[in-house]
């Protein structure tokens, strides 16, 4: 099943202490999916979309960006025929960067 879209939700972090908000959206025909957020292959958070909605927002507290590993990806799962769980492809990566200090 098709990959979700992924994007940073404003406000964008300006330091490692700022929270990070990441939205993941499934295609329109997959509402109520279960979403998993990964960083560098490690599970960061799981969220389920409401039954009438196709997206979630992961809210990560400040300092989450300090964790080692690669960029963020997300993936969703839905129940298919015979109640078998089907997983989507991984989303494109999203990188979190901070402005270079001016001092």
């Amino acid at each position: 099943i098709p990959a979700p879209s992924i994007r940073l939700v404003p406000p964008y972090p300006s330091s490692q202490e700022d929270p990070i908000h990441i939205a993941c959206m499934a295609p329109g025909n997959f509402p109520g999916a279960n979403f998993t957020l990964y960083r560098g292959g490690q599970v960061v958070q799981l969220l389920q979309a409401p039954t009438d909605q196709r997206g979630v927002t992961f809210n990560l507290s400040g300092g989450s960006s300090k964790a080692p590993g690669g960029p963020f990806h997300c993936q969703y799962g839905v129940l298919g025929e015979l109640n078998q769980s089907q997983l989507s492809d991984l989303s494109e990566p999203v990188n979190v960067s901070f402005p270079v200090p001016t001092w």
Partner: antibody, heavy 122, light 110 residues
Framework: QVTLKESGPALVTPTQNLTLTCTVS??????????WGWIRQPPGKGLEWIGS???????YYNPSLKSRVTISVDTSKNQFSLKLSSVTAADTAVYYC??????????????WGQGTLVTVSS | QSVLTQPPSVSGAPRQRVTISCSGS????????VNWYQHPPGKAPKLLIY???LLPSGVSDRFSGSKSGTSASLAISGLQSEDEADYYC???????????FGTGTKLTVL
């Protein structure tokens, strides 16, 4: 049911500082799903976003007001506050506090206070 | 000066349909989702539409939103007298790094 209520002076003298407080009831200000913001409406004009704060203290401000604005949060009292320095008559407005919810892949202001009219005059 | 432009006023007779436009640029509407708020006189603003076209629970399905490119629209069908209010589009502007509201549109039900 979440409610927000603004409190503070109705009249402020030019060049003074304005401080308003928003008290949140029926929900925790410390949730990771919300920002808490201030929006104003000068008489006969439209809505203008002033700035917002996260429970952790992270803030972001309207660039046109940034040099005069400070927003702070007191999680123990479930309150957040706006300080606007060196006010002028142009700061006369109805000031609203509001909750910004992060949900469903985006965000929106879902709960608003009733607003408080602040007049800047000598 | 707002970076989102709306018509100052629109009007319609009861049971008619009206639309309110909101014009922006790539840094706001073009790259970000749009919300719509209803602001009745003397009351607090109320969320009407979020994420371009989604309806919050409790809001009448007479209201609908759409977006194309750097413009968004709010449609109100079956106009009622209680719809009289100011309406604002809103989104995020990546250039300003902040929330922006439209100039506002006053709806009059004739």
């Amino acid at each position: 049911q979440v409610t927000l209520k603004e409190s503070g002076p109705a009249l402020v003298t030019p060049t003074q500082n304005l401080t308003l407080t928003c008290t949140v009831s029926g929900g925790s200000i410390s949730s990771s799903s919300y920002y808490w913001g201030w929006i104003r409406q000068p008489p006969g004009k439209g809505l203008e976003w002033i700035g917002s704060i996260y429970y952790s203290g992270s803030t972001y401000y309207n660039p046109s007001l940034k040099s005069r604005v400070t927003i702070s949060v007191d999680t123990s009292k479930n309150q957040f506050s706006l300080k606007l320095s060196s006010v002028t008559a142009a700061d006369t407005a109805v000031y609203y506090c509001a909750r910004r919810r992060n949900s469903s892949g985006w965000f929106y202001f879902d709960y608003w206070g009733q607003g408080t009219l602040v007049t800047v005059s000598s | 000066q707002s970076v989102l432009t709306q018509p100052p006023s629109v009007s319609g007779a009861p049971r008619q349909r009206v639309t309110i436009s909101c014009s922006g640029s790539r840094s706001n509407i073009g790259d970000n989702a749009v919300n719509w708020y209803q602001h009745p006189p003397g009351k607090a603003p109320k969320l009407l539409i979020y994420y371009d076209d989604l309806l919050p629970s409790g809001v009448s399905d007479r209201f609908s939103g759409s977006k194309s490119g750097t413009s968004a629209s709010l449609a109100i069908s079956g106009l009622q007298s209680e719809d009289e209010a100011d309406y604002y589009c809103a989104t995020w502007d990546d250039s300003l790094n902040g929330h922006v509201f439209g100039t506002g549109t006053k709806l009059t039900v004739l």
